[in-house]
Interface confidence: low
């Protein structure tokens, strides 16, 4: 249990409040982490509060400015770059966003050895994505979808590709799936190790159907915004890898990486790409039917210039009951003889877990066991391999950084961070320097964050990094509430489940009940991290108890749990909070008739069908932004998980999953539909099907659009949407304003 | 429509220079490498270096390494081959050829220019 | 430098008949041969590139075929307008070559 102190003493009663709305909206109460810019194995750069970028230096403990902040305004520069040679930087301004990780800004080269900005060749703008090689100072650039390449910031560039085109084909950048759903980033080139080789992915959209939507914008007529988005059965991108040589480009141009051919034969994703060495790299690839993928490493062959790929060197990994890895599938972290790796993957009993592969995937090494789950490898040195999992008392919501020295046999582990700091921290992430000399560790809660500096040898604590002091003081006569986070046992099933519970909480006191669920596949949402938020002021102010449940589908407690929704969306996950209801109504403090369920995206997907469950539970909810039909959403995400809509697949289940063949059982409940017109990612096609199939039923329900918003309903939007979801639960658990 | 054309021919006297232009129409000049390429009477076809309009990076073949030069002007389209120190056996008629530049396998000189005729008599 | 052997030299064919020119390179080239075509007077025309890919605008009774260092141009039936010379090219390295060029005429 954790318990977060409400500091309620008699004598200070008086002078300490509870959570207001407005603390929330105007994130009153937010903190900070401290991730250092590793340049080497001792130095980091560090953006300081007065904006001047600095150079800390460990071992020497000096510090000095390397581009003062009058530089950094001259050109309105909110992020920098530092080339490996320490001569140039690239600043970046006019930051305009475009999906969840893709923005396009406009880049200037400061020439850190005559104070000057870099004149002539200048970078055009705006640049779609741009980075300095790993040594030196070359530099890789997307524009207009075209990929070009700058031997130095001064000269001319080199195109490297031709045949970019907007919404058609992507050189060095994903489109729109691929950025959400395979990659995760707004690149798809990488450079090696040395910078002798940049490997890049081209995506064909051409044949994809186009999403079209609204903007309004202030214009007389709309914009129309068109995205090549493949929904669940459609076309899909076509994807090929190439490389070119960036120290002779010109002389046989990039080459073609040849794709594995059990994976060619049928439609396949790219899903990522590994430097292991400047000659040799690893892709990863994955069948449209997301059980199989092939890790293929290939090498250049100086003789042809090209790249080999042999059979030898492919990695089989499959999945024989769910999809292949977890939310995606691991990627390999090589060791220092450059051919064997680690990864993660199920082992035997369905726990996801550190395996050394030397040949084959059939003889692999299981390097971690038991019934927990190893989450991220951090780093391979050439004695130690640290990584982060949730073994530690047996809290899968839980984080904590590992060390196994590889280096002598038998291989020891030991947890780094388990008991530095045990009641505030147990929720960890960690960053390193080259060769894992020092490393920085930053802690997400339960308590206060702190990011702190280790030795990389010996684990010493150097200093601490940031500790949010002004949060800590700014708490201080805040009612803050009681979190606690404990299981059900349930059929067999573990759910965990955390409660946020109002300050002066009474067990013996009735209490309204609201659920926040998002209940994804492989999500997460019973974390032991800190947090004040909307659900911290409505249990603060309001008087709310607020519970979030990790149920079937969740992740970090095994396959079983995990794939328990293969096929099924919408069906467990929905069970489960329901399940928790009953079972947090039988704890005696929780009032039956004021119980609400709100959830955003998957969430307001499970949130619309529980409120339609017919289970009479729930007297309201609200779904912001919800996925309201399988067919409605991207291939990529939607078939990992339901397979195909066709007959012969799973069309069935896509049919019965839907919101609207459940729009009658909304006539018992009170339902807030919310949803921005501009969302590019859960299209607003999915709330107006909703809202149609309401109609139809003569069903009565809420609704708020936000025009112009995305997924993420940000800005003024993100006020009103708050303030207005408050009305709504406080109208309906009869709380007066 | 796509094409090269080359200068006219011409006779030098041994050890003078000669500058053969050749200007592109029809396509995106710095799309393309430039070959150049020559062909003595009834011989063969030999290879002498490119240039990459984009950069104005150049590769000759080793033979014409220090007697060649290759420039190209992207504002008219057009690029030089210049030849130095001439000798009797560079009679020939001196082409240029475009290449792809982008993707695998170096495509092939699709596009040739006319050839220009190179007399060196004394 | 990479040299290129062609054979035969010169061969004599009538029209539709199935001629087959070979091309060696001294090492590996991959598949970074192209194949050419000359008429007297007039520039050549590149016809394969790749080893094996037609150029467009090429007949398709033109094929190429072979990687490494052994390649065969293919003309399936010789036309009037395929009298010609016939050269390799390897794009492999620097400097590029040709091969010697193979001479088809009427027999």
């Known amino acids: 249990i954790v318990l977060r102190p409400s500091r309620v003493h008699n004598s200070e009663e008086n002078t300490m409040r509870a959570l207001t709305l407005k603390d929330i909206l105007n994130g009153t109460f937010s903190y900070k982490t401290f991730f250092p810019n590793w340049i080497s194995g001792q130095e980091y750069l560090h953006q300081s509060a007065d904006n001047n970028i600095v150079l800390y230096n460990i071992e020497t403990g000096q510090s000095y400015t390397i581009l003062s902040n009058r530089t950094m305004k001259s050109v309105n520069a909110s992020n920098y770059g530092l080339s490996p040679d320490r001569q140039f930087v690239y600043l970046e301004s006019d930051y305009s966003k475009l999906w969840r990780y893709s923005y396009t800004a406009t880049y200037y080269i400061y020439d850190l050895s005559n104070g000057e900005f870099v004149r002539g060749n200048e970078l055009p703008r705006p640049i779609q994505y741009l980075c300095w090689s790993p040594v030196g100072s070359k530099l890789a650039y997307v524009y207009q979808n075209n990929i070009y390449l700058k031997q130095r910031p001064g000269d001319p560039p080199f195109q490297i590709t031709f045949n970019g085109r907007e919404n058609k084909i992507f050189n060095g950048i994903p489109d729109w799936v691929y950025e959400e759903e395979m990659l995760a980033t707004k690149y798809a080139l990488w450079w090696s190790p040395n910078g002798k080789f940049l490997a890049y992915a081209e995506f064909n959209d051409t044949d994809i159907p186009v999403i079209a939507y609204s903007y309004y914008g202030d214009e007389q007529y709309p914009r129309t915004i068109n995205i090549p988005y493949p929904k669940a059965g459609a076309k899909n991108p076509v994807v090929r890898i190439f490389i070119i040589d960036t120290t002779y480009p010109a002389y046989v141009g990039p080459q073609e990486v040849p794709v594995p051919a059990m994976i060619a034969s049928s439609d396949y994703y790219f899903s990522w790409l590994t430097w292991v060495t400047d000659e040799r790299v690893c892709l990863q690839w994955l069948k449209r039917v997301q059980n199989v993928s092939v890790l293929s490493i290939c090498d250049f062959r100086e003789d042809w210039q090209t790249w080999d790929c042999p059979k030898t060197q492919e990695h089989i990994e499959e999945s024989r009951t769910g999809w292949a890895g977890g939310f995606f599938v691991s990627t390999p972290v090589f060791s220092y003889d450059a051919i064997s790796y680690y990864k993660i993957f199920s082992d035997k009993d369905g726990y996801k877990h550190i395996h050394y592969i030397k040949d084959t995937v059939e003889n692999a090494i299981q390097i971690t066991s038991g019934k927990w789950e190893a989450i991220n490898i951090f780093r391979v040195t050439q004695d130690s391999l640290f990584y982060s999992s949730n073994e530690f008392e047996e809290y899968p919501g839980r984080r904590n950084i590992y060390r196994i020295s590889i280096g002598s046999y038998p291989p020891s582990k030991k947890c780094v961070t388990c008991h530095l700091r045990k009641e505030r921290c147990q929720y960890y992430t960690a960053s390193f320097s080259d060769y894992a000399k020092y490393y920085a560790l930053v802690c997400y809660g339960p308590g206060i964050p702190i990011s702190t500096l280790h030795d990389g040898r010996t684990d010493q604590e150097i200093k601490i990094l940031e500790e949010n002091k002004e949060l800590e003081n700014a708490l201080k006569n805040i009612q803050l509430p009681k979190e606690e986070i404990k299981k059900l046992e349930v059929d067999e099933i573990t759910l965990w489940y955390k409660m946020i519970l109002p300050p002066q909480f009474d067990r013996s006191k009735k209490y309204p009940l609201l659920i926040q669920v998002y209940g994804g596949p492989c999500s997460q949402s019973v974390r032991s991290v800190f947090a004040v938020n909307w659900i911290s002021y409505l249990a603060s102010k309001e008087g709310m108890v607020i519970a979030l449940v990790d149920g079937r589908g969740t992740a970090f407690q095994g396959d079983k749990l995990l794939y328990a929704v293969y096929r099924k969306l919408g069906v467990y996950e929905v069970e489960d909070q329901i399940t928790a209801v009953r079972k947090f109504i039988e704890m005696g403090f929780i009032d039956e008739k004021r119980i609400a369920i709100w959830g955003w995206s998957y969430g307001g997907y499970v949130s619309s069908l529980a409120l339609a469950s017919g289970t009479g539970l729930f007297k309201c909810g609200i779904a912001v932004a919800p996925v309201s039909s399988w067919e409605y959403y991207a291939s990529v995400y939607t078939e990992r998980f339901m397979g195909l809509p066709t007959k012969d697949d799973n069309l069935e289940h896509y049919k019965n999953s839907t919101v609207m063949a459940r729009a009658e059982y909304f006539r018992n409940v009170d339902y807030l539909l919310i949803h921005g017109t501009a969302d590019d990612n859960v299209h607003f096609q999915n709330s107006a099907q909703i809202a149609k199939a309401l109609v139809n039923a003569q069903v009565d329900f809420q609704a708020m659009w936000y025009s112009d918003q995305n997924h993420g309903l940000s800005g003024l939007s993100t006020n009103h949407l708050y303030t207005h979801m408050t009305h709504f639960l406080k109208q309906c658990f009869s709380l007066s304003d | 429509q796509v094409q090269l054309v080359q200068s006219g021919a011409e006779v030098k006297k041994p050890g003078a220079s000669v500058k053969v232009s050749c200007k592109a129409s029809g396509y995106t000049f710095t799309g393309y490498y430039m070959n150049w390429v020559r062909q003595a009477p009834g011989q063969g076809l030999e290879w002498m270096g490119w240039i990459n309009p984009q950069s104005g990076d150049v590769n000759f073949a080793q033979k014409f390494q220090g007697r060649v030069t290759m420039t190209r002007d992207t504002s008219i389209s057009t690029a030089y081959m210049e030849l130095s120190r001439l000798r009797s056996d560079d009679t020939a008629v001196y082409y240029c050829?475009?290449?792809?530049?982008?993707?695998?396998?170096?495509?092939?000189?699709?596009?040739w220019g006319q050839g220009t005729t190179v007399t060196v008599s004394s | 430098d990479i040299q290129m052997t062609q054979s035969p030299s010169s061969l004599s064919a009538s029209v539709g008949d199935r001629v087959t020119i070979t091309c060696r390179a001294s090492q590996n080239i991959g598949s970074y041969l192209n194949w050419y075509q000359q008429k007297p007077g007039k520039a050549p025309k590149l016809l394969i590139y790749?080893?094996?890919s037609l150029q467009s605008g090429v007949p398709s009774r033109f094929s190429g075929s072979g990687s490494g260092t052994d390649f065969t141009l293919t003309i399936s039936s010789l036309q009037p307008e395929d009298f010609a010379t016939y050269y390799c090219q390897q794009a492999n390295s620097f400097p590029f070559t040709f091969g010697p060029g193979t001479k088809v005429d009427i027999k």
């Open positions: 790749a080893a094996s």
């Open positions: 050829a475009r290449q792809f530049r982008g993707y695998s396998y170096g495509y092939g000189m699709d596009v």
